[in-house]
């Protein structure tokens, strides 16, 4: 069984290559009873969803940039 069907995780797998310019927003879900792992879910500018690898340095930079832009708005 996949992680998503074993727990209530939303990310079955993570997208490896994604350009920050294609991302509209990012939601970081902390681990909880529903899912034991941190999940990074990006909403793309085309309206689709993608799960990103929270351990990836590029993803960390994307999250940091998004959070900073939220604070400045």
């Amino acid at each position: 069984a996949s992680v998503a069907t074993e727990l209530r995780c939303q990310c079955l797998q993570t997208l490896q290559g994604i350009h920050p310019k294609n991302i509209q927003s990012v939601n970081v879900k902390s681990p909880g009873p529903h899912c034991a792992q941190t999940e990074v879910i990006a909403t793309l500018k085309n309206g689709r969803k993608a799960c990103l690898n929270p351990a990836s340095p590029i993803v960390k930079k994307i999250i940091e940039k998004m959070l900073n832009s939220d604070k400045s708005n």
């Epitope: 069984a1 727990l7 209530r8 990310c11 079955l12 009873p33 969803k49 993608a50």
Partner: antibody, heavy 125, light 107 residues
Framework: EVQLLESGGGLVQPGGSLRLSCAAS????????MSWVRQAPGKGLEWVSA????????YYASSVKGRFTISRDNSKNTLYLQMNSLRAEDTAVYYC??????????????????WGQGTPVTVSS | DIQMTQSPSSLSASVGDRVTITCRAS??????LHWYQQKPGKAPKLLIY???NLESGVPSRFSGSGSGTDFTLTISSLQPEDFATYYC?????????FGQGTKLEIK
């Protein structure tokens, strides 16, 4: 045709037990999480419990934790709800629901996209 | 637990009206919210998933929007078959929780 059919409801005395069943057909049962949702007479929807596709993970509302047990038999395509120490406030129509929702290969949402017809449970002396 | 609050609790409208129902979460739930329709004596039916996506077979007069804590369900032009009770539901975390429902009645 995707279908869920509940059974096992009825009248039971306070403190009694009941086991509800939900027979699934028309989809790969073992791949999807399932939930039980109830509705007391004239009231809104209340989520009761959920179980992962393999049955390895279970979740409960605080109002039923320790009294109700959710389980599934994937070989029989059947979901169960064992209800013990029943109280008057457990009186409701009980629905089983499939939690579908795979979007692309990277993202999964949990929406109750298929529901059974409901089975009534009355707890009364 | 995440509390979901719907408003109004009941609403009277006429065929052809545009109707908006709101749902507020007690904490941010991103867009992890669904809308259901229920008619008397029937099981609920999924209308909108993930705040804004129309479930297959649902008429396009239904639409959803919102993210974070505030969400809306809009029916652009009420039809006779739309008179029912509507519920929002979050799945951001367990326990899953529903709003108390909005009963849409004929004026």
């Amino acid at each position: 045709e995707v279908q869920l059919l509940e059974s096992g409801g009825g009248l039971v005395q306070p403190g009694g037990s009941l086991r509800l069943s939900c027979a699934a057909s028309g989809f790969t049962f073992s791949e999807l999480s399932m939930s039980w949702v109830r509705q007391a007479p004239g009231k809104g929807l209340e989520w009761v419990s959920a179980i992962s596709g393999s049955g390895g993970s279970t979740y409960y509302a605080s109002s039923v934790k320790g009294r109700f047990t959710i389980s599934r038999d994937n070989s029989k395509n059947t979901l169960y709800l064992q209800m013990n120490s029943l109280r008057a406030e457990d009186t409701a129509v009980y629905y089983c629901a499939r939690e579908g929702g795979r979007l692309e290969p990277y993202y999964y949402y949990y929406a109750m996209d298929v529901w059974g017809q409901g089975t009534p449970v009355t707890v009364s002396s | 637990d995440i509390q979901m609050t719907q408003s109004p609790s009941s609403l009277s409208a006429s065929v052809g009206d545009r109707v908006t129902i709101t749902c507020r979460a007690s904490q941010s739930i991103s867009d992890n919210l669904h809308w259901y329709q229920q008619k008397p004596g029937k099981a609920p039916k999924l209308l909108i998933y993930d705040a804004s996506n129309l479930e297959s077979g649902v008429p396009s007069r239904f639409s959803g929007s919102g993210s974070g804590t505030d969400f809306t369900l809009t029916i652009s032009s009420l039809q006779p078959e739309d008179f029912a009770t509507y519920y929002c539901q979050q799945y951001y975390s367990t326990p899953l929780t529903f709003g108390q429902g909005t009963k849409l009645e004929i004026k």
